[in-house]
Interface confidence: medium
Amino acid sequence: VEVATHYLEIITQLIVESFHFKNGEDAPDLLKVITKPFTKLIVQLDKKVISQIAMNDEKAKNKSLVKIWCKTFTNKTQINVTVPSTANCTSPSLCWTDGIQNWTMKNVTYKENIAKCQHIFVNFHLPDL
């Protein structure tokens, strides 16, 4: 039937033309919509680590590109910490002494992992190389 009528080719052409692509750059976006759900099931990469590598950040050296945790909870709190001198204080208003140590307030971010990603490589712990 396809050989005689080329119906698949004609239908596909009509679908593609209905998207009104202005240039060749728009076409991959359609492919992304189709392929992304499938690639997500195979592997997910950590965008933060990729950015750190691009920025030549030392922190990224021992981090895996494979994303493990997809759901995290970040909690920002303030804690009291000792400092060697008032020069090390966060600000003069946030500095005090107990007579034997200088103290200041420090912002601390606690990151709690809640749910793992749902892809094949999540539990493989393979090296990136």
Epitope: T82, P84, S85, T97, D98, G99, I100, Q101
Partner: antibody, heavy 120, light 107 residues
């Protein structure tokens, strides 16, 4: 005049507990940070623990952290050191010491010391 | 932790001599340094605080100097009663550490 009188020392077996006390007089106890400093036989001085004048902040040397607890009772002008899980290396003369009048933990008055011997 | 290193560990000098004991901190401690004297079988006694301030009642032959990491205790004219072990102490930040001591004897 300033007086610091320690008590509670003695012979104890490894793993045992002991409570040292220091009776303070001759100064405003509630205004001074206090500390315990020890000296093993024939050895140098080692700071053990400290407590701020209010009692809100306590400090410990790594060697005693989790085993010793410092506290103060302003109503009785007493400083205490609860020692548990004692080891042979805790054998020393324990001095109660008063903070100097300026900022920081230096010691302008010391007690006569109480000997703690940890041995089986 | 800040390590305090004293030198020499022992020294022998004659009555009337000028004696100096050095103390070095492994990190900058500003001038938050104290010196103590401990005579044999006795309790430590504060000599100097904030590196150079003489404690009330301490003879003027004792003096202290230095700032940052290097400090010195000087006895301008050694007396027989100065026989003792001398300790420096960091009180810039916890843990408050002492030097290992310098034993001073009379020749």
């Amino acid at each position: 005049q300033v007086q610091l009188l320690e008590s509670g020392g003695g012979l104890v077996q490894p793993g045992g507990s002991l409570r040292l006390s220091c009776a303070a007089s001759g100064f405003t106890f509630s205004s001074s940070a206090m500390a315990w400093v020890r000296q093993a036989p024939g050895k140098g001085l080692e700071w053990v623990s400290a407590i701020s004048s209010s009692g809100d902040n306590t400090y410990y040397a790594d060697s005693v952290k989790g085993r010793f607890t410092i506290s103060r009772d302003t109503s009785k002008n007493t400083l205490s050191l609860q020692m548990s899980s004692l080891r042979a290396e805790d054998t020393a003369i324990y001095y109660c010491a008063k903070q100097g009048t300026n900022w920081g933990l230096y010691f302008d008055y010391w007690g006569q010391g109480t000997l703690v011997t940890v041995s089986s | 932790d800040i390590q305090m290193t004293q030198s020499p560990s022992s020294l022998s000098a004659s009555v009337g001599d000028r004696v100096t004991i050095a103390c070095r901190a492994s990190q900058v401690i500003s001038n938050y340094l104290a010196w103590y004297q401990q005579k044999p079988g006795k309790v430590p006694k504060l000599l100097i605080y904030v590196a150079s301030t003489l404690q009330s009642g301490v003879p003027s032959r004792f003096s202290g100097s230095g700032s940052g990491t290097d400090f010195t205790l000087t006895i301008s004219s050694l007396q027989p009663e100065d026989v003792a072990t001398y300790y420096c102490q960091n009180y810039n930040s916890a843990p408050w550490t002492f030097g290992q001591g310098t034993k001073l004897e009379i020749k």
